[in-house]
C-alpha cells in the first residue's frame, strides 16, 4: 500500500508552444517514477508549465537556468 | 477570465451526427488539454475523452468508435464530433479544461455544457 | 474494465467532518491514479475541487482536503456548513483514461 504517499508531479502531456525565455524563474525535471519524461518550468506568474525534455528549446532553457544559478 | 463556452447541442433522431464546439477564453489550447465529459438526465458524470496541446486524443474506449475530438488553436476552440447517436447519448455534454501537470487538479474550469437529445 | 465506487449518500451536520470515500475494482489507489474531486451542485456546472489526490485550486475552501491510502481514496470536509450540499463525483486515472465514480450526495443536516 502507498498509504500517505506524497504526489509526485508528472506530465501527463507537454504545452505544443515555446514559452517565451523570459517569462521562466526556474524548472525541475520530473521523477522517473512518470510514466514519461518531463521538464516543469515555473513561470514568473507562478504557473507550471509541462514541456518536453527531447526538445531543442527546452534544453536551451534549461542549460541557461543553470548556468544563472 | 478563463471561460468556456459549449454550443451545438440539440435535438437529433437515432443514427444522426451533431458536432459541439466549445470556444475557450482566457488561455491557450496549446498548454492544456481539453476534456468533455457528458451527464445523462439525473445520473453522474461521464468522461468522453481529451485532446491534449499537440493534438493527440485519448477516448472512453465504449465511446470512441463513434466520437472523435479535434480542435483548432487559431479559434481556440475543441470540438467533439458524434456519429451514429443513440437514444442513450441523450446527456448534458461538458467541455473542461485540463492542467497538464498530475497533481493539479486535472479539469478545473468547466462550461455550463450544451444538451443533446437523441429521440426520434 | 474499471469501475470507481463512491457511497450514494452521506450525511453530516453542519460544523461536523464529512469523509466521502472513492475505491477502485483493480486494487489499490495509489498516487499514480491522480485523484480528482469534482462538486457539483443542483442545476450547476461542476467545479474541481482537489486535483492530483490533494491539491487545491484557488478559490476552494482549506475545509476541503484529499487523501490516499490503500484501496481507497478519501474527499474530506472539515467542518461541512450548509453550502457544501452537493453532489461528489471522484475520478481516478488509469493510464490513458479517466473512470469517474458514480456520485456521493453530501446532505448536511
Known amino acids: 500500500s502507498l498509504a500517505a504517499d506524497t504526489p509526485t508531479a508528472c506530465c501527463f502531456s507537454y504545452t505544443s508552444r515555446q514559452i517565451p525565455q523570459n517569462f521562466i524563474a526556474d524548472y525541475f525535471e520530473t521523477s522517473s517514477q512518470c510514466s514519461k519524461p518531463g521538464v516543469i518550468f515555473l513561470t514568473k506568474r507562478s504557473r507550471q508549465v509541462c514541456a518536453d525534455p527531447s526538445e531543442e528549446w527546452v534544453q536551451k532553457y534549461v542549460s541557461d537556468l543553470e548556468l544563472s544559478a | 477570465e478563463v471561460q468556456l463556452v459549449e454550443s451545438g447541442g440539440g435535438l437529433v433522431q437515432p443514427g444522426g451526427s451533431l458536432r459541439l464546439s466549445c470556444a475557450a477564453s482566457?488561455?491557450?489550447?496549446?498548454?492544456?488539454?481539453m476534456h468533455w465529459v457528458r451527464q445523462a438526465p439525473g445520473k453522474g458524470l461521464e468522461w468522453v475523452g481529451v485532446i491534449w496541446p499537440g493534438g493527440g486524443t485519448n477516448y472512453n474506449s465504449a465511446l470512441m468508435s463513434r466520437f472523435t475530438i479535434s480542435k483548432d488553436n487559431s479559434k481556440n476552440t475543441v470540438y467533439l464530433q458524434m456519429n451514429s447517436l443513440r437514444a442513450e447519448d441523450t446527456a448534458v455534454y461538458y467541455c473542461a479544461r485540463g492542467p497538464l501537470i498530475t497533481t493539479e487538479v486535472s479539469m478545473d474550469y468547466w462550461g455550463q455544457g450544451t444538451l443533446v437529445t437523441v429521440s426520434s | 474494465s474499471a469501475e470507481v465506487t463512491q457511497p450514494p449518500s452521506v450525511s453530516v451536520s453542519p460544523g461536523q467532518t464529512a469523509r466521502i470515500t472513492c475505491s477502485s475494482n483493480t486494487g489499490a489507489v495509489t498516487t499514480s491514479n491522480y485523484a480528482n474531486w469534482v462538486q457539483q451542485k443542483p442545476g450547476q456546472a461542476p467545479v474541481g475541487l482537489i486535483g492530483g489526490t490533494n491539491e487545491r485550486p484557488s478559490g476552494i475552501p482549506e475545509r476541503f482536503s484529499g487523501s490516499s491510502s490503500g484501496n481507497t481514496a478519501t474527499l474530506t470536509i472539515s467542518g461541512a456548513q450548509a453550502e457544501d450540499e452537493a453532489d461528489y463525483y471522484c475520478?481516478?486515472?488509469?493510464?490513458?483514461?479517466?473512470?469517474f465514480g458514480g456520485g456521493t450526495k453530501l446532505t448536511v443536516l
Open positions: 475520478a481516478l486515472w488509469y493510464s490513458n483514461h479517466w473512470v
Open positions: 482566457g488561455f491557450s489550447l496549446t498548454g492544456y488539454a
